[in-house]
C-alpha cells in the first residue's frame, strides 16, 4: 500500500490522543533506555510503511502484535485516514486469522514495540533532518 495520500495530521492526532498511551501501557515496566532504535524512516509515508510492517507482520521471536490495543487502533486509523487502505488489507487479515496464536509478551516483542515508538515519534516530526 502506498501511504502517500493519507491524512497525516489526522493520523498524528489519533496517535497523540490514544495510540501513544497504549504503546506506553504495553511497555510499562521497561526502561526507556533498554532498547536501541535500529529502525528508522525518512518521511511520513515511509514511516507509516515501517509502522505497518512492524505492527502487523510476524517476526522471529514476536509472533503477533496485531491483537494488542495499539495495533487495533493503528489499523483503524489507517483504515479511516488512508484512502483505500481497508481494501488492501482484506486478504492479509484473512491470512492472519488462520495463523493467530495466543498473546505472549516476549522480550523481542517489547523491543519491537520500542522500535514502533521511535517510528511514531519520527512520524510526528516530519521536518526534522535524518541524523
Amino acid at each position: 500500500y502506498d501511504f502517500t495520500n493519507c491524512d497525516f495530521e489526522k493520523i498524528k492526532a489519533a496517535y497523540l490522543s490514544t495510540i501513544s498511551k497504549d504503546l506506553i501501557t504495553y511497555m510499562s515496566g521497561t526502561k526507556s533506555t533498554e532498547f536501541n532504535n535500529t529502525v528508522s524512516c525518512s518521511n511520513r509515508p515511509h514511516c507509516l510503511t515501517e509502522i505497518q510492517s512492524l505492527t502487523f507482520n510476524p517476526t522471529a521471536g514476536c509472533a503477533s502484535l496485531a491483537k494488542e490495543m495499539f495495533a487495533m487502533k493503528t489499523k483503524a486509523a489507517l483504515a479511516i485516514w488512508c484512502p483505500g487502505y481497508s481494501e488492501t488489507q482484506i486478504n492479509a487479515t484473512q491470512a492472519m486469522k488462520k495463523r493467530r496464536k495466543r498473546k505472549v509478551t516476549t522480550n523481542k516483542c517489547l523491543e519491537q514495540v520500542s522500535q514502533l515508538q521511535g517510528l511514531w515519534r519520527r512520524f510526528n516530526r516530519p521536518l526534522l533532518k535524518q541524523q
Epitope: K10, L16, S17, T18, M72, I80
Partner: nanobody, 132 residues
Framework: EVQLLESGGGLVQPGGSLRLSCAAS????????ITWFRQAPGKGREGVAY????????YYADSVKGRFTISSDNSKNTVYLQMNSLRAEDTAVYYC?????????????????????????WGQGTLVTVSS
C-alpha cells in the same frame, strides 16, 4: 463556507429534558460524522455522543448512556441530541463537531470519536444549565 449552528440550550431543572439541534451547511452532510462535545467550566472538551450520517451508527460516553439519544435527519442536514434525566453535572457548553472520514468508517471510529483534536469543523456552542 462550512457552518455548524447549535440551538436548544437553556436552563432546566434536574430530571428535566432538552433537545439540542445542530444545523449543518457547506459540506456533504451524508458522508460525515457529527459528534456532540461538551465543556464544563475549567474542564476539557468531553465527547458525549457520535453519529455517522452515512450508516446511522451511534456511540455514547458512559456518563450519558441511557439518558441521551443522538439522531440525524439527513433531509434537513441536522443532528439532534435528546437529553433526558438531566443532572447538575450535565451543565456545560455543548458543541457539535464534524469530521469527514469517520462517517464512512464508523466501526473503526469507535476508538477515536471522542477526541476533539480529530474534528474539522465546530459550531459556536450552546449553553445548558441544569439547576433548581
Amino acid at each position: 463556507e462550512v457552518q455548524l449552528l447549535e440551538s436548544g440550550g437553556g436552563l432546566v431543572q434536574p430530571g428535566g429534558s432538552l433537545r439540542l439541534s445542530c444545523a449543518a451547511s457547506g459540506f456533504t452532510f451524508g458522508d460525515y460524522a457529527i459528534t456532540w462535545f461538551r465543556q464544563a467550566p475549567g474542564k476539557g472538551r468531553e465527547g458525549v455522543a457520535y453519529i455517522s450520517n452515512f450508516d446511522g451508527m451511534t456511540y455514547y460516553a458512559d456518563s450519558v448512556k441511557g439518558r441521551f439519544t443522538i439522531s440525524s435527519d439527513n433531509s434537513k442536514n441536522t443532528v439532534y441530541l435528546q437529553m433526558n434525566s438531566l443532572r447538575a453535572e450535565d451543565t456545560a457548553v455543548y458543541y457539535c463537531a464534524a469530521e469527514g472520514r469517520m462517517g464512512t468508517h464508523s466501526r473503526d471510529s469507535v476508538y477515536f470519536w471522542a477526541f476533539s483534536a480529530l474534528y474539522d469543523y465546530w459550531g459556536q456552542g450552546t449553553l445548558v444549565t441544569v439547576s433548581s
